[in-house]
């Protein structure tokens, strides 16, 4: 639980951080946990502690293993662990998996590749970026503060993407890299205002005293993946989880994406054994996203049961 | 600068949940844990409990245990904080604010009210 | 938990004037790790948010006007505005920056006469 993974390169500078939070004056212990020996916080050392930041500098592959640190607070000291692990730099151009950061996805409106963990180190601009380790190179690339913008991103942008940069210590400067994979969404569809499907405007829906009724709202939204779209029923302008009638529940429908790339939702309005005060109500089926808010209102009546006699 | 942006001003009814948000930056996220505060009308400040941000491990004051949930998106650098089974006395003005020594940052407040 | 009891509850002073606020908390706030008094004071005026004036129970925030100043260590603490000004209206607590719950007094209300 309180434990987190770092990796690094071997000859480059590698900083973990303490996996326990604490205040600024707070002191932080770090040992060595297989032979309980103290880090110390001497700068002069390789490796050396300094508050919540443990400092490899640089890593060597024998660093690898479990460091504890214990943060000491009035009340009570929190433990924390970083599992440490130093890899051999790799001859070839290939990044393995276990190198590799979390996966950033990308579309042409949104090209932003943050370099991993670079906010725990002491570096100037500029970044250096790599793709698939050949240097990035054109306008089409712009290196801004902590993250790498890709202009006019294409399916052929995805790949491994490394950063580069200078980690400073007390006038000595050491080399980190990072590396994570990018992927490119298919930015071809497109939003549009809210349309309702079901049901109509100002709908009258014939319902059974004691029966179940459902009630469903459907509406699409445009094409392609939504950054922000929802349905949802109201009654009487307050939301369903408010009114606090268990009998009437929504419940989500099926994502559907039409032939036609539309993409649409379902909000299905479950009232079981419908009573009289039910025909009293407003019903509003809302679809909403970025563009707005649509809003078709139904009502209930009663369904005259059929007359057998006639 | 470091700012703490929350979420509008909500309006529930007795029995219900709220959750509200607070979106940091000017600062890196993960590198200080975050605190929920509340004030009643006319009343006192109440700490309701905090998160580690990076490990995502929560806190709570024995007063809400139960009842509040907090959570972090480390992604969108926000921290959440979720009351259920809301009465009338949850009538607050409720606050984030970062770890420190003190609070030295706070987030504008939203206000929540509990009516039926 | 720890109780904070602050006194008085308020006070009317005229500009100029040395202003004290009290705060006392039912446990010592003193951390013998790092000789930290784990204490914080705030002001707050209506309708605004909570101003950090002094954490460690003597050090002031960066930014806050000298004229404000806090003293004490354990369980008995002070905060002091050395020359009142108009603009320190405004209800001042303190904090329990020690241990959760982390507990605020039931504040002081500062006016001017």
């Known amino acids: 639980k309180f434990s987190k993974q770092s990796w690094g390169l071997e000859n480059e500078a590698l900083i973990v951080r303490c996996p326990r939070q604490g205040k600024p004056s707070y002191t932080v212990d770090w040992y060595y946990s297989q032979t309980n020996k103290s880090i110390p916080t001497q700068e002069r050392n390789r490796v050396f502690a300094s508050g919540q930041l443990l400092k490899f500098l640089p890593a060597a592959v024998a660093d690898s293993g479990i460091y504890t640190c214990i943060v000491r607070s009035p009340t009570f000291n929190r433990t924390g662990y970083a599992n440490v692990t130093i890899y051999k730099k790799q001859s070839d151009c290939n990044v393995p998996d276990y190198l590799m950061y979390s996966t950033v996805s990308g579309s042409e409106k949104n090209s932003k590749i943050y370099c991993p963990t670079i906010d725990l180190y002491n570096w100037t601009a500029p970044l250096e970026w790599f793709k698939n380790c050949q240097a990035l190179q054109g306008s089409r690339y712009r290196a801004h503060k902590s993250f790498l913008v890709i202009d006019n991103v294409m399916t052929e942008d995805a790949g491994d993407y490394t950063c580069k940069f200078i980690h400073n210590e007390n006038g000595a400067n050491y080399s980190v890299t990072a590396t994570r994979s990018f992927t490119v969404k298919d930015e071809q569809g497109f939003s549009l205002f809210p349309v309702i499907g079901a049901p109509a405007q100002n709908e009258i829906k014939e319902v059974e005293i004691g029966k179940n009724a459902n009630l469903t709202c459907s509406a699409c939204f445009g094409k392609g993946t939504q950054f922000l779209a929802a349905v949802l029923w109201q009654l009487n302008g307050t939301k369903i989880t408010d009114f606090g009638e268990p009998r009437i529940q929504q419940e989500e429908g099926q994502n559907q994406s039409f032939s036609n790339g539309l993409a649409c939702l379902d909000m299905v309005l479950r009232i079981a054994d419908v009573k009289e005060e039910d025909l009293l109500l407003q019903y509003d089926c809302l679809a909403l996203n970025l563009h707005g808010l649509r809003r078709h209102t139904v009502r209930l009546s009663r369904k005259n049961p059929i007359d057998h006699h006639s | 600068q470091v700012q703490l942006v929350q979420s509008g001003a909500e309006v529930k009814k007795p029995g219900a949940s709220v959750k509200v948000s607070c979106k940091a930056s000017?600062?890196?996220?993960?590198?200080?844990?975050m605190n929920w505060v509340r004030q009643a009308p006319g009343q006192r400040l109440e700490w309701m409990g905090w998160?580690?941000?990076?490990?995502?491990?929560?806190t709570y004051g024995d007063n809400f245990k139960g009842r509040v949930t907090i959570t972090r998106d480390t992604s969108a650098s926000t921290a959440y904080m979720e009351l259920s089974s809301l009465r009338s006395e949850d009538t607050a003005v409720y606050y984030c604010?970062?770890?420190?020594?003190?609070?030295?940052?706070w987030g504008q407040g939203t206000l929540v009210t509990v009516s039926s | 938990d720890i109780q904070m009891t602050q006194s008085p509850s308020s006070l009317s002073a005229s500009v100029g004037d040395r202003v004290t606020i009290t705060c006392k908390s039912s446990?010592?706030?003193?951390?013998?790790?790092?000789?930290?008094?784990?204490l914080a004071w705030y002001q707050q005026k209506p309708g605004k948010v909570p101003k950090l004036l002094i954490y460690?129970?003597?050090t002031r925030e960066s930014g806050v006007p000298s004229r404000f100043s806090g003293s004490g260590s354990g369980t008995d603490f002070t905060l002091t505005i050395s020359s009142l000004q108009p603009e320190d209206v405004a209800t001042y607590y303190c904090?329990?920056?020690?241990?959760?719950?982390?507990?605020f007094g039931g504040g002081t209300k500062v006016e001017i006469k």
């Open positions: 604010a970062r770890e420190g020594d003190g609070f030295a940052y």
């Open positions: 000017g600062y890196t996220f993960i590198n200080y844990g």
């Open positions: 998160i580690n941000t990076y490990i995502g491990e929560p």
């Open positions: 446990q010592s706030l003193l951390y013998s790790g790092n000789q930290n008094n784990y």
């Open positions: 460690g129970a003597s």
């Open positions: 904090q329990n920056d020690h241990s959760y719950p982390y507990t």
